[in-house]
């Protein structure tokens, strides 16, 4: 006995519903046929689709697919894009006032020196900006190049200020004997570690969003498989076929589909999740000598003290590199000592410490919360996007691929999926290769971030303390112990507030001949939703 | 690239003289310091002199008063005026410069031989 | 004057990690200086300002300076690096430069 004809004896609704995806009737029956040609849609009586539509449905339901994935990991890669935006212009900005500091500095404390000066920090702070986006610099070059080049502008124009110009001939020897004799100390080794550690910490950190971003956009525009493809259309539209336009999908139904579809994007979960933990513990450490805000924004006052140092040791110094380093027409070497107030400016220089409402701590941590609100992100997806689809509630009177059912069992429906193509195959294939790419690049950057040199909690302040931040020691050689806090002492009291009303803030660009004083762009301020103050340490 | 050429080693007598010479090349002669280092047969280097760039000379104990340093920038050269010359100063004398790097060029060598 | 103090040799087997230390008074707080010296030919500058490699050098050679002892390590030694090592520092004081004797390194 025929099994019953489809509702729509006429195909009608069936028509003006293909239509609104594909204009034009032509591949529309009028009346239901046999369907013998139908790979996906298997008949089991007359139907209202030809081979033509099934393909159309197909194409259409991998690009339902893509739209609801792209639906799903919107507000997620929004978040992602914001952050790494907002924090890449937050670090250039950290890194302008922390240039703008030492600038300042230079300008208040050794004006002398200030138009080379100027020159040499511009240098050092655009390789330092460099280096967080991802260039291949040595910090410690970095460092050494900034002294290499300060010293003999120091030594020619604040130790032996009657030289002539023509006395930096001996730049390579004065450099030389810079390190030998450690003139400064052992301020460069200690600003090394400092920015260093900072910087590598504040690269990976945003290595890591970029990462975070790249994760996201490849399982956005992932092309799912002619096997998906033909599940997602059993499932959305095949029921069209039998007229039953207004059946949903039974919930667990999808939910089987959706695993199989998106067996390969779950395996990133794994990875995801180690991602978001690892970026967590990276964000936790992020503090003292790991806060490249705290030290590169204390860095003018490190250069301050270091040096302060060569000072101290002017006389003996002199003597010493003035027989080594001697310009050519130079004969007598001058033991000249230079009291303190040729070099420092007798202004006692005060930072107010105004407890800051929102910094780039907060707004870390801030994000990594909100990211871990999302951190079984792809092992949630199928669920999501079923829930996301319409399907029936209850998995009561909903289509289950074949019919229409009172109630839907996963068995039978595996069974009757059984001939058409194997669920289970489909699922063993393992990822495309754009996601296993994009699993060993999580991977990698789990590794690194896992592995940064970052202390373990709050214990090791005593560590720190040790490799000379903030200590009161200041190495072995209690000399080096220049200024630490007294009179005359700049020190910025931690972190930077956003709402920025930087008096001296001036620019390499405008600073060598020209007082004026710059103030920082708007959309500076407008970018941090007011992050709190930027207290300038020189007023 | 960076050069520097010895010459004026041999065989000398005990009491005798010698002068060693050292052309530098590929490099701004005189922005650098210039040292004298030498190695006795089957021993270890040991410092003998250096100039600095303006003509402050230094020596080792062993050699003072006997031997002189000098150098000109004209001629890009660097000179070692070995007097009283002892058994004892038997070694293989290396030029080398002195700049950022420390002593981070050196010449090819030059033997020089006291003997009677 | 100033002394550095080096021992005469040091032996180890091809990829593993030598290290030749340097001893000296309070010798952290000068530069040490690292050449490489092989029979026949004039010294090479390996490790400069305690730490700093000269471009060329393998990163395999690094130095390290603190207290009374400066030591160079060579990790994955590999059979061209046996020679001899001198350490070397500039004493301002005595306005000396002053080498150590060497440490012939034997790769086995």
């Known amino acids: 006995q025929p099994p019953p004809p489809p509702p729509d004896a006429t195909c009608h609704q069936v028509r003006s519903f293909f239509q609104r995806l594909q204009p034009g009737l032509k591949w529309v029956p009028e009346t239901p046929v046999p369907g013998s040609d139908l790979q996906v849609c298997l008949p089991k009586g007359p139907t209202c689709c030809s081979r033509k539509m099934e393909e159309k449905y197909q194409l259409t339901a991998r690009l339902n697919m893509e739209q609801l994935l792209q639906s799903a990991s919107m507000e997620l890669k929004f978040l992602i894009i914001q952050n790494a935006a907002v924090f890449q212009e937050a670090f250039e900005i950290v890194v302008r006032h922390a240039k703008n500091y030492t600038n300042a500095m230079f300008k208040n404390n050794y004006p002398s020196l200030t138009p080379q000066a100027f020159e040499f920090v511009g240098e050092f702070f655009t390789d330092v900006s460099l280096y967080i986006l991802g260039s291949d610099i040595n910090v410690d070059d970095m460092v050494n190049e900034l002294f290499d080049s300060l010293f003999p502008v120091i030594y020619t124009q604040l130790m032996n200020p009657g030289l002539p110009d023509s006395a930096l001939d001996i730049n390579e020897c004065l450099r030389g004997a810079r390190r030998d004799l450690k003139v400064f100390g052992n301020f460069p080794k200690l600003i090394m570690t400092q920015v260093s550690k900072s910087l590598q910490v504040t690269r990976i950190f945003l290595q890591a969003l970029n990462l975070g971003i790249e994760v996201i956009n490849t399982t956005d525009h992932l092309k799912f498989s002619k096997d998906c493809g033909r599940m997602l259309t059993r499932m959305w539209y095949c029921s069209y076929c039998q007229g039953l336009m207004m059946v949903k999908p039974c919930g667990g139904y999808c939910n089987v589909v959706m695993q199989g579809c998106m067996a390969g994007v779950v395996e990133i979960d794994k990875y995801w999740r180690e991602y978001i933990l690892s970026l967590e513990e990276l964000v936790n450490g992020m503090y003292r000598i790991y806060d490249m805000e705290n030290v590169l924004l204390g860095l003018f006052s490190t250069i301050h003290d270091s040096i302060q140092y060569v000072q101290k040791n002017a006389g003996k110094l002199t003597t010493t590199i003035g027989k080594l380093c001697a310009h050519s027409q130079q004969r007598q070497y001058r033991s000249a000592y230079y009291p303190e107030d040729l070099f420092i400016d007798k202004k006692v220089l005060k930072v107010a410490h105004v407890e800051h409402e929102e910094t780039l701590s907060s707004r870390r941590r801030e994000l990594i919360q909100k990211l871990k609100s999302f951190i079984s992100f792809y092992s949630a997806l199928p669920g999501y996007i079923c829930s996301h689809s319409p399907v029936a509630e209850n998995d009561t009177l909903c289509w289950n691929g074949q019919e229409l059912v009172e109630r839907y069992s996963q068995k039978a429906a595996r069974n009757g999926m059984k001939n058409q193509f194997n669920l289970h195959e489909l699922k063993m294939k393992g990822p495309e290769p754009v996601v296993s790419q994009i699993i060993d690049k999580l991977k990698h950057i789990n590794q690194l971030l896992r592995t940064m040199s970052m202390p373990k909690g709050r214990v090791l302040d005593k560590n720190l303390d040790e490799e000379g931040f903030e200590s009161g020691d200041c190495g072995d050689d209690e000399d080096e112990c220049i200024g630490g806090s007294g009179d005359g002492m700049i020190k910025v009291k931690n972190q930077l507030r956003f709402l920025a009303e930087l008096a001296y803030d001036l620019d390499v660009d405008d600073a060598p001949g020209n007082s004026q004083q710059a103030t920082p762009k708007d959309n500076e301020i407008s970018t941090f939703h007011n992050l709190g103050n930027v207290h300038s340490p020189l007023k | 690239q960076v050069q520097l050429v010895q010459s004026g080693g041999g065989l000398v007598h005990p009491g005798g003289s010698l002068r060693l010479s050292c052309a530098g090349s590929?490099?701004?002669?005189?922005?650098?310091?210039m040292h004298w280092v030498r190695q006795a047969p089957g021993k270890g280097l040991e410092w003998v002199s250096a100039i600095g760039t303006g003509g402050g000379t230094y020596y080792a104990d062993s050699v003072k008063g006997r031997f002189t340093i000098s150098r000109d920038n004209a001629k890009n050269s660097l000179y070692l005026q070995m007097n009283s010359l002892r058994a004892e100063d038997t070694a293989v004398y290396y030029c080398?410069?002195?700049?950022?790097?420390?002593?981070?060029?050196w010449g090819q060598g030059t033997l020089v031989t006291v003997s009677s | 004057s100033y002394v550095l103090t080096q021992p005469p040799s040091v032996s180890v087997a091809p990829g593993k990690t030598a290290r030749i230390t340097c001893g000296g008074n309070?010798?952290?707080?000068?530069?040490v200086h690292w050449y490489q010296q092989k029979p026949g030919q004039a010294p090479v500058l390996v490790i400069y300002y305690d730490s700093d490699r000269p471009s060329g050098i393998p990163e395999r050679f690094s130095g390290s300076n603190s207290g009374n002892t400066a030591t160079l390590t060579i990790s994955r030694v590999e059979a061209g690096d046996e020679a001899d090592y001198y350490c070397?520092?500039?004493?301002?004081?005595?306005?000396?430069?002053?080498f150590g004797g060497g440490t012939k390194l034997t790769v086995l």
């Open positions: 070397q520092v500039w004493d301002s004081s005595s306005d000396h430069w002053v």
């Open positions: 309070n010798i952290g707080s000068k530069s």
């Open positions: 590929g490099f701004t002669f005189s922005s650098y310091a």
């Open positions: 080398a410069r002195y700049g950022r790097k420390s002593i981070d060029a």
